[in-house]
Amino acid sequence: QEEDLPRPSISAEPGTVIPLGSHVTFVCRGPVGVQTFRLERDSRSTYNDTEDVSQASPSESEARFRIDSVREGNAGLYRCIYYKPPKWSEQSDYLELLVKESSGGPDSPDTEPGSSAGPTQRPSDNSHNEHAPASQGLKAEHLY
């Protein structure tokens, strides 16, 4: 009998408010045994896959999707889904990335801390479930 897969979580480092030109990394987490993580955008047709999955804890695996230089087009809602053979999980909640005009250097401390859950996240619309290659530091730039 197939196991019920827990929903993945998504967070952003260093936070969800990123100055223009700075970097951001989306972190997708799921159970151990995940083969593929996919990062999707709300209302966009693009996505990124990675099979570079690391073990974050004895019970959890993760994958990281990095955007080196954030642009205005990167702002929006992101979510994760994973494949643990023989099936895909449900999608995570949406995480909203905000891009602001840079007021300081790329290490300016005014970015919000990353969060993997909480009221700022929009629940994933599961009517979008039909949608169902990066490495640690995967470039996710085409997810505009």
Epitope: T36, S43, R44, S45, T46, Y47, N48, D49, I81, Y83, P85, K87, W88, S127, H128, N129, E130, H131, A132, P133, H142
Partner: antibody, heavy 115, light 110 residues
Framework: AVKESGGRLVTPGTPLTLTCTAS????????IQWVRQAPGKGLEYIGA?????YTYYASWAKGRVTISRTSTTVDLKMTSPTTEDTATYFC?????????????WGPGTLVTVSS | ELVLTQTPASVSAAVGGTVTIKCQAS??????FAWYQQKPGQSPKLLIY???NLASGVSSRFKGIRSGTEYTLTISDLECADAATYYC????????????FGGGTEVEIN
């Protein structure tokens, strides 16, 4: 590659199953759509099997066809074909990184429904 | 239900000329949009995906533009090999927008 099979001459009302076989890639990552083209006509969307295992149909196709998938194939079952279903049937796979475009198409399989 | 209205149904142009094909969507479909070329007896070939991205191996003479719910395919410096039927498609299967093809545009090169 993807390749359709199962097309043949059938009489109206005879169920028919077409199979789209994937090779050279992992089917679990991709949406597969079924499209048909009647002789001398345009492309007509039938439905799709998504990577996550969901199935969707064009409004006209609901109840007339059933789409299912295995780890290497996606089937299109025509429950009770009529002469209007005579067409070449294509399956196609979307491109890496973008769900909107289907770059990998099979050669098509011809279904003829005639009494 | 989503409807894609493609115009014109047919067009004739000279070698070296330019052809413009339009596809009007009945609702906003964002980037869930592609253009295909099909020649007689062949399977469709992807030209443009994501409304404006050139598919791999496709000549840069093909250009896709989105303006609201109107999508345009422009073929410049026409060659004899461009004679074909062109189709637009929205492929947001099962989601907000749905999936459908336009009626097609037959391009003749004279």
């Amino acid at each position: 590659a993807v390749k359709e099979s199962g097309g043949r001459l059938v009489t109206p009302g005879t169920p028919l199953t077409l199979t789209c076989t994937a090779s050279g890639f992992s089917l679990y990552k991709y949406n597969i759509q079924w499209v048909r083209q009647a002789p001398g006509k345009g492309l007509e969307y039938i439905g799709a099997s998504t990577y996550a295992g969901y199935t969707y149909y064009a409004s006209w196709a609901k109840g007339r066809v059933t789409i299912s998938r295995t780890s290497t194939t996606v089937d299109l079952k025509m429950t009770s074909p009529t002469t209007e279903d005579t067409a070449t049937y294509f399956c196609a796979r979307h491109i890496d990184g973008d769900y909107s475009g289907y770059a990998l198409w099979g050669p098509g399989t011809l279904v003829t429904v005639s009494s | 239900e989503l409807v894609l209205t493609q115009t014109p149904a047919s067009v004739s142009a000279a070698v070296g000329g330019t052809v413009t094909i339009k596809c009007q969507a009945s609702q906003s479909i964002g980037t869930w949009f592609a253009w295909y070329q099909q020649k007689p007896g062949q399977s469709p070939k992807l030209l443009i995906y994501g409304a404006s991205n050139l598919a791999s191996g496709v000549s840069s003479r093909f250009k896709g533009i989105r303006s609201g719910t109107e999508y345009t395919l422009t073929i410049s410096d026409l060659e004899c090999a461009d004679a074909a039927t062109y189709y637009c498609q929205c492929s947001d299967v099962g989601n907000t927008y749905g999936a459908a093809f336009g009626g097609g545009t037959e391009v003749e090169i004279n």
